[in-house]
Interface confidence: low
Amino acid sequence: DAHKSEVAHRFKDLGEENFKALVLIAFAQYLQQCPFEDHVKLVNEVTEFAKTCVADESAENCDKSLHTLFGDKLCTVATLRETYGEMADCCAKQEPERNECFLQHKDDNPNLPRLVRPEVDVMCTAFHDNEETFLKKYLYEIARRHPYFYAPELLFFAKRYKAAFTECCQAADKAACLLPKLDELRDEGKASSAKQRLKCASLQKFGERAFKAWAVARLSQRFPKAEFAEVSKLVTDLTKVHTECCHGDLLECADDRADLAKYICENQDSISSKLKECCEKPLLEKSHCIAEVENDEMPADLPSLAADFVESKDVCKNYAEAKDVFLGMFLYEYARRHPDYSVVLLLRLAKTYETTLEKCCAAADPHECYAKVFDEFKPLVEEPQNLIKQNCELFEQLGEYKFQNALLVRYTKKVPQVSTPTLVEVSRNLGKVGSKCCKHPEAKRMPCAEDYLSVVLNQLCVLHEKTPVSDRVTKCCTESLVNRRPCFSALEVDETYVPKEFNAETFTFHADICTLSEKERQIKKQTALVELVKHKPKATKEQLKAVMDDFAAFVEKCCKADDKETCFAEEGKKLVAASQAALGL
């Protein structure tokens, strides 16, 4: 359904408030260093222009594409060259190359100051003073730090952010009301950003087919009663939504996501029995709820998979006639029967099945060749099961902090070239798998753990891609999306690594560590641990544990001292000397 004016169409569909919010998100995700006021000015100009097009779709420039309109607007920024360097060259290109160029310059780790939360009273005053600007700043700050954040979902976060301030700024104890809500939004936001980053990486690095395969598996687990044609339709629509959002087409994405939620709710009887509550909510809550909805119950008496995919004489005929449709059906049938498997495991099984058919359907006796294909699945299923069992046992034994430390040591030894902040961030997140997933019963552990690990390892991949330093990381990140985790798991100590020179400055601490939050103090200690392993990659667990225990005691002692700074200086020197001796540095 072609519209004379795309910008008028989206403005009318989304409404002014959502239109302005989405344009602000889009601009902040592209020009991540631009001041807030500059973005607001650009957004207001685009909004005024959109209103002229709503009034008269034939007005000048109203027929231009959104990329052309938005790109032209971004290219009016006076400081583009000095702020962004070569990104300014994008403006010399025509669409669609210009938009592609902007996309390529999105920075997953922008050099922006850490967001420091003001005092509650200060925030409440700012909120009451100018609610609209306050909420716009939230959108702007999140979007520029997370250039792939799922835009319609960010609108949902902003709605919750507003609700938190509306409620808590009137409460007797504002801080007790507000701070837990803001912490929850921050943690959920980081998780949401990382999940979406994986979807965009899947589409951009491995293509539509890879994303569709993921979606078939996940939606089949979630909606096992839906028939294959229904799942296929949802997959096609979901792929369009995410392709648009990952491609910077945020207005189209939000519009199409709303349409998809509407379709799902209108057809919930043929999709899932779990959607009723979601479908009674307002739009943003509805879409979020659908995305998080629990798996429906599996239909009773599902027949054996072997009949259609192994025993049938028509396997090769069906495969040859429509390869991807047949493989899609295999994935659908397998996934709906296995909510206990991770999506990546299901995709490995489908890949194994595909490889077997490719080989066997060209053989003299195809049926004889592929008859035992399901036997090949056994080791693929057991590998993550065993890994999760071992790591959950370790987590239960150590607790989260020490489990993170074990992973820090493990991953630093695997890929010591990776920057220390990246290793700390990724290993801390890997370690969170314990508290997130190990509490679940067996049937839910694997989908929780392995699919979460895929999200975290993608963070490592995108951060590493910006500044590649390790061939091993590049190899694990680029060879196969579904085998990233097994690839990293299989890495042993990097024997080619030349240990880092010892630098006492790295292990010098000051009294400011005493005023840090528990989390920030942990990060300081974990940073030191990574540096230790980089200096002494062959250090044993026992050696490292002894040094870290001494370090914790040293921090505790000096933070209790009257003259903290002197304590850190004098005791610190002793600690460094003792650690060097203990590790043979």
Partner: nanobody
Amino acid sequence: DVQLVESGGGVVQPGGSLRLSCAASGGTFSTYVMGWFRQAPGKEREFVSAISQNSIHTYYADSVKGRFTISRDNSKNTVYLQLNSLRPEDTALYYCAASRFTSWYTADYEYDYWGQGTLVTVSS
């Protein structure tokens, strides 16, 4: 099955232009990723360009970036390849290909259906 028929090839001087077309029949065209490949005499078939179902993504081989443009018209079941600034090394048989799902890999095995090809000769 999808049938693909290419047209628009011919002889052209260096620096000249051509527009190749590929008409599809027998399937739902808008559900297929479309690609162009080429094979020069005595060489392997190589990827030239691809376009996603709804034209959101376009991909080009480095050797043709900035000179060739892929587009499609789903209402006409046709994909086009505009060839500008042609060079002698662009001489080849140009094939149109269709894939229901593609990983955006440049490998020809990703594509399920192929045309017979149209010959482009660049010579002075």
